[in-house]
C-alpha cells in the first residue's frame, strides 16, 4: 500500500511524482530530485526530502537587502548524498570538493575537510531535544493534557510510537519534547525520531510536507497553541569530533 | 460525548465472510486511531490490529494476516473490519476500541459485535 | 510477542476488603520510564472500561480507590476497598509492542 489509489498521490510526501506505473497498475510515487520510489504510508526519510527540496524550483521573490548587520542563517540546507535506503551517507562533500561527516539526521559532526576525508559509519543520533517556545496565552497550559496531545500528535500524524517520546517537558512558555530511540529499540517499520522531528519542524514552520492536508492545527483542550521559535538538539550516540579550534 | 456504535449480531456459514461496522461520534474522527479486539465465549481479549483513521491504513496481528481487513470511511466516520474464510474458533464478541491520547491504551470501546460462525 | 501472566486466576473477597491482582510480563514494558501497561474493567455482557493507564494514571471517572503500581515487568492492580460493584474480570494490557497482547484476566468474586 504505498500511495492513494483514487487520485494517485503521496499523502506523506507532496514533494514527489506519482503515476500508476507500479505493480498491476498500482499508484507508484518517487521522491522528487532523487527519483526514488517512496513508500507513502510513511513517513519519507529526510534525507531524500531535503534533496527533494534542493531540487524544488524556487519562487520568484522581490530581493530585499539585508542589513550589514544580519546573521545568515542557512537552515541546514545543502543537496545531501542520500544511500540505497534513503538514509543519508556518512560523508557529505559539496561542489567545491569540501567534505564531512554527518549523523542520520545530516547534521555535520566533524570539522570540514577534503576528498580525503573519511568518516567510517553513519552515526545514529538516538536523543533528540526539541525546544518550542509557545505565543503567550490566557493561561498555562495543564501538562499532562499538553503531554498527551503531544504524544497522540506524534504516533497519529508521524506514525511514531510513544514510547519514543521519552518525555514532554514544560515551563510556561517553554516546551520541551525529548525523542529518544536506540537502535536497539527501532524495530523494521518504526519510524525513525529524526525523519518524525523533521515533519514537525517542517509542521511548525508552516511549511507543511503533507499532500493537500490543511497546516498543523495544534490545540489542547481546545486552546490554540501557537510556536513562536523552535531550536532542535540533536545527541548521538558516539560523540561529535570537532577540533578544539572550533569551540573556542 | 464520545461514543462508538458497532453494527448488529451476525450469524455465518464456515468459509464465509463477515463485516462489523463501528461509526464515532463526539470527537474529530481522523484524530485517533481505531483498534479491533475480539473475545471467544467464556475466554480473554485478543488484539486484531489497529487502523490509521488519518492515513487509512492499517497493521495486523500476524495471526490474522491475510484473513482480516480494516478500513475507514471518513465521510460518515465509521470504520469497518472484514473478517474472510471463517471457522467456528471465530466466534466471539467483536469490540472496537479507540486509542487513548497518549500511550495506546483503550479508552472508549464499542458495545460488541456478536458473530456466530455456525454450518 | 509480550505474554502477559495474572495471577490469581480467581480472587474470592468480601466487600470493604483490599483487592491485590498481579500482571507479569515476559519481557520489559517500559520506555525511558514510560510504562506501556493498561489495566481494564470487564462485566458480564459488557465491554471492558479503562481503569488505569500507564500502569499508575487513573482514567478520568474512575474512582480513586482502583490504583496501579510497579514498572518493567512486575505490575500490580490494588482496589483499596472493594465496593459491591467491583465484582468483575481485570485484565492487564501491553501496548509497547504490536501484536498488543492481553493477560488471561482475573476475576474477583464475592465470597
Known amino acids: 500500500h504505498t500511495a492513494a489509489q483514487d487520485n494517485c498521490t503521496c499523502p506523506t510526501n507532496k514533494m514527489t511524482v506519482c503515476s500508476p506505473d507500479g505493480p498491476g497498475g498500482r499508484c507508484q510515487c518517487r521522491a522528487l530530485g532523487s527519483g526514488m520510489a517512496v513508500d507513502c504510508s510513511t513517513l519519507t526519510s529526510k534525507c531524500l526530502l531535503l534533496k527533494a527540496r534542493m531540487s524544488a524550483p524556487k519562487n520568484a521573490r522581490t530581493l530585499v537587502r539585508p542589513s550589514e548587520h544580519a546573521l545568515v542563517d542557512n537552515d541546514g540546507l545543502y543537496d545531501p548524498d542520500c544511500d540505497p535506503e534513503g538514509r543519508f551517507k556518512a560523508r557529505q562533500c559539496n561542489q567545491t570538493s569540501v567534505c564531512w561527516c554527518v549523523n542520520s539526521v545530516g547534521v555535520r559532526r566533524t570539522d570540514k575537510g577534503d576528498l580525503s576525508l573519511r568518516c567510517d559509519e553513519l552515526v545514529r543520533t538516538h536523543h533528540i531535544l526539541i525546544d518550542l517556545r509557545h505565543r503567550p496565552t490566557a493561561g498555562a497550559f495543564n501538562h499532562s493534557d499538553l503531554d498527551a496531545e503531544l504524544r497522540r500528535l506524534f504516533r497519529e500524524r508521524y506514525r511514531l510510537h510513544p514510547k519514543f517520546v521519552a518525555a514532554v517537558h514544560y515551563e510556561q512558555p517553554t516546551i520541551q519534547i525529548e525523542l529518544r530511540q536506540n537502535t536497539s529499540q527501532k524495530a523494521a517499520g518504526d519510524v525513525d525520531i529524526g525523519d518524525a522531528a523533521y515533519y514537525f519542524e517542517r509542521d511548525i514552520k508552516g511549511e507543511s510536507l503533507f499532500q493537500g492536508r490543511g497546516g498543523l492545527d495544534l490545540r489542547v483542550r481546545g486552546e490554540p497553541l501557537q510556536v513562536e521559535r523552535t531550536l532542535i538538539y540533536y545527541l548521538d550516540e558516539i560523540p561529535p569530533k570537532f577540533s578544539m579550534k572550533r569551540l573556542t | 460525548q464520545v461514543q462508538l456504535v458497532q453494527s448488529g449480531a451476525e450469524v455465518k456459514k464456515p468459509g464465509a465472510s463477515v463485516k462489523v461496522s463501528c461509526k464515532a461520534s463526539?470527537?474529530?474522527?481522523?484524530?485517533?486511531?481505531i483498534n479491533w479486539v475480539r473475545q471467544a465465549p467464556g475466554q480473554g481479549l485478543e488484539w486484531m490490529g489497529v487502523?490509521?483513521?488519518?492515513?487509512?491504513?492499517?497493521s495486523y496481528n500476524q495471526k490474522f494476516k491475510g484473513r482480516v481487513t480494516m478500513t475507514r470511511d471518513t465521510s460518515t466516520s465509521t470504520v469497518y473490519m472484514e473478517l474472510s474464510s471463517l471457522r467456528s474458533e471465530d466466534t466471539a464478541v467483536y469490540y472496537c476500541?479507540?486509542?487513548?491520547?497518549?500511550?495506546?491504551?483503550?479508552?472508549?470501546w464499542g458495545q460488541g459485535t456478536l458473530v456466530t460462525v455456525s454450518s | 510477542e509480550i505474554v502477559l501472566t495474572q495471577s490469581p486466576a480467581t480472587l474470592s473477597l468480601s466487600p470493604g476488603e483490599r483487592a491485590t491482582l498481579s500482571c507479569r510480563v515476559s519481557?520489559?514494558?517500559?520506555?525511558?520510564?514510560?510504562?506501556?501497561m493498561h489495566w481494564y474493567q470487564q462485566k458480564p455482557g459488557q465491554a471492558p472500561r479503562l481503569l488505569i493507564y500507564r500502569a499508575s494514571n487513573l482514567e478520568s471517572g474512575i474512582p480513586a480507590r482502583f490504583s496501579g503500581s510497579g514498572s518493567g515487568t512486575d505490575f500490580t492492580l490494588t482496589i483499596s476497598s472493594l465496593e459491591p460493584e467491583d465484582f468483575a474480570v481485570y485484565y492487564c494490557q501491553q501496548s509497547y509492542e504490536d501484536p498488543y497482547t492481553f493477560g488471561g484476566g482475573t476475576k474477583v468474586e464475592i465470597k
Open positions: 476500541a479507540r486509542y487513548g491520547d497518549g500511550y495506546n491504551q483503550f479508552d472508549y
Open positions: 463526539g470527537y474529530t474522527f481522523t484524530d485517533y486511531s
Open positions: 487502523i490509521s483513521t488519518y492515513y487509512g491504513d492499517a
Open positions: 519481557e520489559s514494558v517500559d520506555s525511558y520510564g514510560n510504562n506501556f
